[in-house]
Amino acid sequence: YYGCPSECTCSRASQVECTGARIVAMPTPLPWNAMSLQVVNTHITELPENLFLNISALIALKMEKNELSTIMPGAFRNLGSLRYLSLANNKLRMLPIRVFQDVNNLESLLLSNNQLVQIQPAQFSQFSNLRELQLHGNNLESIPEEAFDHLVGLTKLNLGRNSFTHLSPRLFQHLGNLQVLRLHENRLSDIPMGTFDALGNLQELALQENQIGTLSPGLFHNNRNLQRLYLSNNHISQLPPGIFMQLPQLNKLTLFGNSLRELSPGVFGPMPNLRELWLYNNHITSLADNTFSHLNQLQVLILSHNQLTYISPGAFNGLTNLRELSLHTNALQDLDSNVFRSLANLQNISLQSNRLRQLPGSIFANVNGLTTIQLQNNNLENLPLGIFDHLVNLCELRLYDNPWRCDSDILPLHNWLLLNRARLGTDTLPVCSSPANVRGQSLVIININFPGPSVQGPETPEVPSYPDTPSYPDTTSVSSTTEITSAVDDYTDLTTIEATDDRNTWGMTEAQSG
């Protein structure tokens, strides 16, 4: 094919691929009709000038994962047809100021994952057709405020994984067509008011993994087309009133891994398209009434790994389409009987690793579609009669790692569990913690004899009376052999369904980092 270099492969479609560590300089001669050239995983360290003079038809040049550290001025001369240029994953520390002057029809320029320490003001001045600029994964600490002034056609700009500590409020003022802006994994501590005001077409804004402490109240007010907003893993301690009021198109919002202590009612303004809200790993201590009332299409709400001690009965008002609620790993001791009343479509609820001592009998009264309830690792000693009776879809109930008190009051729960054992899964069943004569025995299969004294085991140290547990000598193997005396129909029989155990860190859904 017009003299394909031996180190390369050339296709009839005018595509040339050169790869391999043995390549230390650009192979020559390259086919004059080449339209796509890929030079990947080589040991090429520099691009001299006039390198591509004889392949002026080139549209795409991909030079990735090489050892490039030097590009001479004029290296891209005669590539006026080039639309796509990738120099990603090389070792470029600086770029000559006019290095791109011969490729002014570029639509995509990828400079990511190099070692660039600065961008010159005029570096991108001729790129009026540029749609995509990738600068992530470099060592940039600042960018001249006029650097992007001429990129009026830009739709995607990635500045993530650099070392920016601040942004000029006018940096993006000419980027009215921008749809995706990524600033994640930098060192931004605050973002000046007005920084995003010109970005009326922005659909995605990635600010996660910075050091942002405060958000200006009107920071996003001009971004009415925003669909995805990533604010996770920052130092945000509060959300200003109205911060999200002008975001009617938002469908993804991540706020996990911040320092939020409270959520004022209405802070999540009308967002009819928001499906998921990730708030885990904050310091939220309580939830007020109507905190989420504008989010009537929300399906997933993750509040795990906070410090919740109180949830107001109306906190979840308006969440009529919620499917999954994760409240695990908090400090909840008690729940109001009406707290889940408005969650008519809830399917999964995770309440494990709290301090729940008891549950109201009607806690799940209006939540008829529940399929999964995680209550493991709490302080539960018993559960009210009939608490699960109406949950005909329940197929996974986790009750282990609770200090169940297996006295006469446990019989209704015991009987229900006998009839619905498959709902508990197969690997981990709840066991009795007290009295001492039945400690360690399965709550499901234990035989309990009432009335009568506890069966005493051999002498062992007194068990501490923490909390609300009488002191009984501890035994490891004493079993009671007498029969259950109460009726089995204290709990209504439910259709048994096999359940599997899945111990996900954040709840029922894998956490997404944005």
Partner: antibody
Framework: QVQLLESGGGLVQPGGSLRLSCAAS????????MSWVRQAPGKGLDWVSV????????FYTDSVKGRFTISRDNSENTLYLEMNSLRAEDTAVYFC??????????????WGQGTLVTVSS | IVLTQSPSSLSASVGDRVTITCRTS??????LGWYQQKPGKAPKLLIY???SLQSGVPSRFSGSGSGTDFTLTISSLQPEDFATYYC?????????FGQGTKVAIKR
């Protein structure tokens, strides 16, 4: 009589690994959460990790997350701490401790005597 | 959550009333315990849930407080009480200890 006996400590180079064990007796092991607490020489107490009675819930202090793994074998009445990518600042006496309940609480009524882990080149 | 004990050390005589405070950087309800440790020994649980006396611990030990401010009181110091005392919060992961308060014999 409740007894907790730690083992597995010793001298290890930075980046190395150790596995601590804690053999428990005298109580119904599976019905109590267990924890590891460490104490650097001449310093205060530092909570490391906790595991619930079944082993279904585990938690760690931030500095060991991703490096240490707590586990338990309820059939053998043994608690473990797998320690990888060890650093000099992990040097301490490591105590295993029995919680007062099956769920993860920070109240420990019985403690072992500790095993010394030294991380040094 | 940061726990700050005060004082860091104190000297007292047998029979004295001793008070040690523990302040938390965030509200932790009553999810706090107190431990005693003697040199070369493992710690010993004295108080759980801020004010509940652990079984077998002498009644001269008492705990109080809720929210962010907690107190351990020894009503009448005994010779065996000379030790270092630590508070521990288990309201929020990671659980954290205070830096300790050393109670020494007044010379």
């Amino acid at each position: 009589q409740v007894q907790l006996l730690e083992s597995g400590g010793g001298l290890v180079q930075p980046g190395g690994s150790l596995r601590l064990s804690c053999a428990a007796s005298g109580f119904t092991f599976s019905t109590f959460a267990m924890s590891w607490v460490r104490q650097a020489p001449g310093k205060g107490l530092d909570w490391v990790s906790v595991i619930s009675g079944t082993g279904g819930s585990t938690f760690y202090t931030d500095s060991v997350k991703g490096r240490f793994t707590i586990s338990r074998d309820n059939s053998e009445n043994t608690l473990y701490l797998e320690m990888n990518s060890l650093r000099a600042e992990d040097t301490a006496v490591y105590f295993c401790a029995k919680a007062v309940t099956v769920n993860t609480r920070g109240f420990f009524d019985y403690w072992g005597q500790g095993t010394l882990v030294t991380v040094s080149s | 959550i940061v726990l700050t004990q005060s004082p860091s050390s104190l000297s007292a005589s047998v029979g004295d009333r001793v008070t040690i405070t523990c302040r938390t950087s965030q509200v932790i309800r009553n999810d706090l315990g107190w431990y005693q440790q003697k040199p070369g020994k493992a710690p010993k649980l004295l108080i759980y849930d801020a004010s509940s006396l652990q079984s077998g611990v002498p009644s001269r030990f008492s705990g109080s407080g809720s929210g962010t401010d907690f107190t351990l009181t020894i009503s009448s110091l005994q010779p065996e009480d000379f030790a270092t005392y630590y508070c521990l919060q288990d309201n929020n992961y990671p659980w954290t200890f205070g830096q300790g308060t050393k109670v020494a014999i007044k010379r």
